[in-house]
């Protein structure tokens, strides 16, 4: 494949958290700015996926800064929107439930849960705080809801209302009609390249969401953010926006799309259905 083809391949892996951001600035790190005031503000934390308090210095900073918790939630969370993710009659586990627990490359260890496909149970592990994969849940309950079998052997569904792709209407969860398309893309792909705090000069790649390509940068060896990949291939696989076309039996069709033959156009950040 040429670089052009590689850059425009639709990636169908579901190893990373689905893109939830309504605005790209929601992915920015909290920035207190250079001034010395002490002002209580709120920012959206892409790692906890919640709006949190921080102290703002009073000048500069970035757009991920809100006067109130409510304003932050309104701009950066989707409590008032329904995510379109798979809901089928007999739900399969998402592919990521079968991934090995992955602590990632950082060392800010925190408790997380993963689905152990051998024991068929959600179990605790220590996550390093960056990278890793989607078999990584903040709570045992979330892990159980998504990956463990329910009492009837089906998956417990916590994904929300499904879109009927035929007429764009909201369909109850008991529907037999599966959604035709799903969208997966990690939120940290929208964050800027971050060298980090150390003094090394390691060759890494980051996804530049403005130009839609993976670009090299020099990593200091510690700190930084999750938009940090050891190879261009890994960066592309994680961050190129992709659709998964679902056929009626629940199988997946991997779709390749090149620039000249674009058949489907769906906006990157606005894949959600407003409440009716």
């Amino acid at each position: 494949d040429s670089e052009e083809d590689e850059e425009h391949t639709i990636i169908t892996d579901t190893e990373l958290p689905p893109l939830k951001l309504m605005h790209s600035f929601c992915a920015f790190k909290a920035d207190d700015g250079p001034c010395k005031a002490i002002m209580k503000r709120f920012f959206f934390n892409i790692f906890t996926r919640q709006c949190e308090e921080f102290i703002y210095g009073g000048c500069e900073g970035n757009q991920n800064r809100f006067e109130s918790l409510e304003e932050c939630k309104k701009m950066c969370t989707r409590d008032n929107a329904n995510r379109i993710i798979k809901t089928t009659l007999q739900q399969e586990k998402p592919d990521f439930c079968f991934l090995e627990e992955d602590p990632g490359i950082c060392r800010g260890y925190i408790t997380r849960y993963f689905y152990n496909n051998q024991t068929k149970q959600c179990e605790r592990f220590k996550y390093g705080g960056c990278l890793g994969n989607m078999n990584n849940f903040e709570t045992l309950e979330e892990c159980k809801n998504i990956c463990e079998d329910g009492p009837n052997g089906f998956q417990v569904d916590n994904y929300g209302t499904q879109l009927n792709a035929v007429n764009n209407s909201l369909t109850p969860q008991s529907t037999k009609v599966p959604s035709l398309f799903e969208f997966h893309g990690p939120s940290w792909c929208l964050t800027p390249a971050d060298r980090g705090l150390c003094r090394a000069n390691e060759n890494r790649f980051y996804y530049n969401s403005v130009i839609g390509k993976c670009r090299p940068f020099k990593y200091s060896g510690c700190g930084g953010n999750e938009n940090n990949f050891t190879s261009k291939q890994e960066c592309l696989r994680a961050c190129k926006k992709g659709f998964i076309q679902r056929i009626s039996k629940g199988g997946l069709i991997k779709t390749k799309r090149k620039r000249k033959k674009q058949r489907v156009k769906i906006a990157y950040e606005e894949i959600f259905v407003k409440n009716m």
Partner: antibody, heavy 118, light 112 residues
């Protein structure tokens, strides 16, 4: 019955290498993360490192990072500890221990003694 | 790293009498999931460690109910209601809340 049996210990010179093994039986080995823990003579216990269920990822104590490598062979129900650039302070009984679903060590082997001395 | 401090380091006891070991951590062992990953190990002379208690107070299978664990936050206690000859050995507390796992220095229980 869960059994963990370590082997491969012995006397080695400073700077030398040694590979320890832990043979597991009585449980589905591939279902569990595994650990190495050591105990210097007359001293307390020190966690050395952990390997994930499938063996793709590892965690290490700062004291052994870059010198020790944990691996596993799930087909052989075996856990390994490759120790390089050994120092006198690495002298200890090395135990392998199973990790339960709470990420806590539940079963321990009988240990194998590693002595680093010139 | 979290420092675990046990007292006493040596505990001479009379058979049939109670015994108590204290374990303090340098920071709270209450994890984000609401659980406290404080555990106790028993190491009999010449043997490998054996887990006695996990999550502060849960007894491992086969552990006699004369052993009880209690505590919260940073202060924990292991109690033996009536010491028996087979209880002789070294007892370690260790924490699995924060990485890396860390152990207390051990408390040697011996018969007077």
């Amino acid at each position: 019955e869960v059994q963990l049996v370590e082997s491969g210990g012995g006397l080695v010179k400073p700077g030398g290498s040694l590979r320890l093994s832990c043979a597991a039986s009585g449980f589905t080995f591939s279902s569990y993360a595994m650990n190495w823990v050591r105990q210097a003579p007359g001293k307390g216990l020190e966690w050395v490192g952990t390997i994930t269920t499938g063996g793709s990822y590892t965690y290490y104590a700062d004291s052994v990072q870059g010198r020790f490598t944990i691996s596993r062979d799930n087909a052989k129900n075996s856990l390994y500890l490759q120790m390089n650039s050994l120092r006198a302070e690495d002298t200890a009984v090395y135990y392998c221990a199973r990790q339960d679903g709470n990420f806590l060590m539940d079963y321990w082997g009988q240990g194998t003694l590693v002595t680093v001395s010139s | 790293d979290v420092v675990m401090t046990q007292t006493p380091l040596s505990l001479p006891v009379t058979l049939g009498q109670p015994a108590s070991i204290s374990c303090k951590s340098s920071q709270s062992l209450l994890d984000v999931d609401g659980k406290t990953y404080l555990n106790w190990l028993q190491q009999r002379p010449g043997q490998s460690p054996k887990r006695l208690i996990y999550l502060v107070s849960k007894l491992d299978s086969g552990v006699p109910d004369r052993f009880t664990g209690s505590g919260s936050g940073t202060d924990f206690t292991l109690k033996i209601s009536r010491v028996e000859a087979e209880d002789v050995g070294v007892y370690y507390c260790w924490q699995g809340t924060h990485f890396p796992f860390t152990f207390g220095q051990g408390t040697k229980v011996e018969i007077k």
